[in-house]
C-alpha cells in the first residue's frame, strides 16, 4: 500500500508479483525478491518497501535474495541469483544480523 | 477479517525447546506488505520482542534472544512457527504473534501462556 | 536499540479528566513509526494509534497521537471507565522492535 506523504519522498517502483494492485506502487524504496520453496522453482517478485530496510542488507541465501535501490522504476530490469546450493554444515542463516 | 490464532504446549520442560505456532485466517500470509512478528510478555511486567519473519523466510531476531530463537514460515499452511531452544524459568510468558505493516501492529493473536518447570 | 521511556510510570485520573501520556525515544524515531498500544488484564494488546498521530480502524476519536523526532504523547481528551488499562509505546519499522515500559492508568 501507498505510505503517507508525511513519511518522507516516495519513489514510483515496478510492481509484480501475486498481491500487486498495478504495474507500478509507490514506497520509500524499491524491491526486488527473489525466493525459492521447498521443492519449487525460484520466484522473483518486485515491489515496494517501506519498513524494515534491514533486509536490504542480507546476504543472499540458497532461498532468498533481497535487493533495495531508490530510485523511479530502478527494480525494473534486475535480476537476481540466489546462491548455489551448500553443504548444511555451511549453510547461513536467513538472519539479517 | 485477518485472525491470528497461537497453539502449542503450556508447559515445556527446563533445557527443552519451546515451540508455538501462529495459524492466519482471513488473509495471506505471503503478502509483501506484512511482517509477522513473536513477541512475549513476562508475568507482571511489559512486552519484548522476540522477533520478525517475511514472507520470503527473511528473519530478524531480538540480539538479547538470537542465539536461542528460530522463527520459520510456512506459506502453503499460511503459519509461521517459533522455537526457543534451552528454555529456562525466566522463558515463562505469555506470548503473542502479530501482524506489523505501515500501520504498525495491528492484527494480534490472543496469547498462550508458556509455563517452564520440571 | 532505540530504547523507550514512558512517563509517567503510574497516572491516577477521574473519569471525564484528560490524561496526558509521554513516550521518549533514546535516537530519533524513522519515518514517524511510533504506535501506542492499550492493554487490559488478560488480554493481548490492542493499537490505538500508529504512525505517531493515525488512529487505528474503530478507536475513538478522543484518543490522538503527536510528535516527532524522539517526543511522542498519547492523549485521551475525556477519560471514560474503560480506558483505565496499561499504556505502551512502541517503535516499528527498524530491528530491532522496542516497547516503552508502559504508563499504568488508574482511576483516582
Known amino acids: 500500500d501507498p505510505v503517507k506523504p508525511s513519511r518522507g519522498p516516495l519513489v514510483t517502483c515496478t510492481c509484480e508479483s501475486p498481491h500487486c494492485r498495478g504495474p507500478t506502487c509507490q514506497g520509500a524504496w524499491c524491491t526486488v525478491v527473489l525466493v525459492r520453496e521447498e521443492g519449487r522453482h525460484p520466484q522473483e517478485h518486485r515491489g515496494c518497501g517501506n519498513l524494515h530496510r534491514e533486509l536490504c542488507r542480507g546476504r543472499p541465501t540458497e532461498f532468498v535474495n533481497h535487493y533495495c535501490c531508490d530510485s523511479h522504476l530502478c527494480n525494473r530490469n534486475v535480476s537476481l541469483v540466489l546462491e548455489a546450493t551448500q553443504t548444511p554444515s555451511e549453510q547461513p542463516g536467513t538472519d539479517s544480523q | 477479517q485477518v485472525q491470528l490464532q497461537e497453539s502449542g504446549p503450556g508447559l515445556v520442560k527446563p533445557s527443552q525447546t519451546l515451540s508455538l505456532t501462529c495459524t492466519v485466517s482471513g488473509g495471506s500470509i505471503s503478502s509483501n506488505d506484512y511482517y509477522w512478528n513473536w513477541i512475549r510478555q513476562h508475568p507482571g511486567k511489559g512486552l519484548e520482542w522476540i522477533g520478525y519473519?517475511?514472507?520470503?523466510?527473511?528473519?530478524y531476531y531480538n540480539p538479547s534472544l538470537k542465539s536461542r530463537v528460530t522463527i520459520s514460515v510456512d506459506t502453503s499452511k499460511n503459519q509461521f512457527s517459533l522455537k526457543l531452544s534451552s528454555v529456562t524459568a525466566a522463558d515463562t510468558a505469555v506470548y503473542y504473534c502479530a501482524r506489523e505493516s505501515t500501520d504498525g501492529m495491528d492484527v494480534w493473536g490472543q496469547g498462550t501462556t508458556v509455563t517452564v518447570s520440571s | 536499540e532505540n530504547v523507550l521511556t514512558q512517563s509517567p510510570g503510574t497516572l491516577s485520573l477521574s473519569p471525564g479528566e484528560r490524561a496526558t501520556l509521554s513516550c521518549r525515544a533514546s535516537?530519533?524515531?524513522?519515518?514517524?513509526?511510533l504506535a501506542w498500544y492499550q492493554q487490559k488484564p488478560g488480554q493481548a494488546p490492542r493499537l490505538l494509534i500508529y504512525g505517531a498521530s493515525s488512529g487505528a480502524t474503530g478507536i475513538p476519536d478522543r484518543f490522538s497521537g503527536s510528535g516527532s523526532g524522539t517526543d511522542f504523547t498519547l492523549t485521551i481528551s475525556r477519560l471514560e471507565p474503560e480506558d483505565f488499562a496499561v499504556y505502551y509505546c512502541?517503535?516499528?519499522?527498524?530491528?530491532?522492535?522496542?516497547f516503552g515500559q508502559g504508563t499504568r492508568l488508574e482511576i483516582k
Open positions: 535516537q530519533s524515531v524513522s519515518s514517524n513509526y
Open positions: 519473519i517475511y514472507y520470503s523466510g527473511s528473519t
Open positions: 512502541q517503535h516499528y519499522g527498524s530491528s530491532p522492535i522496542t
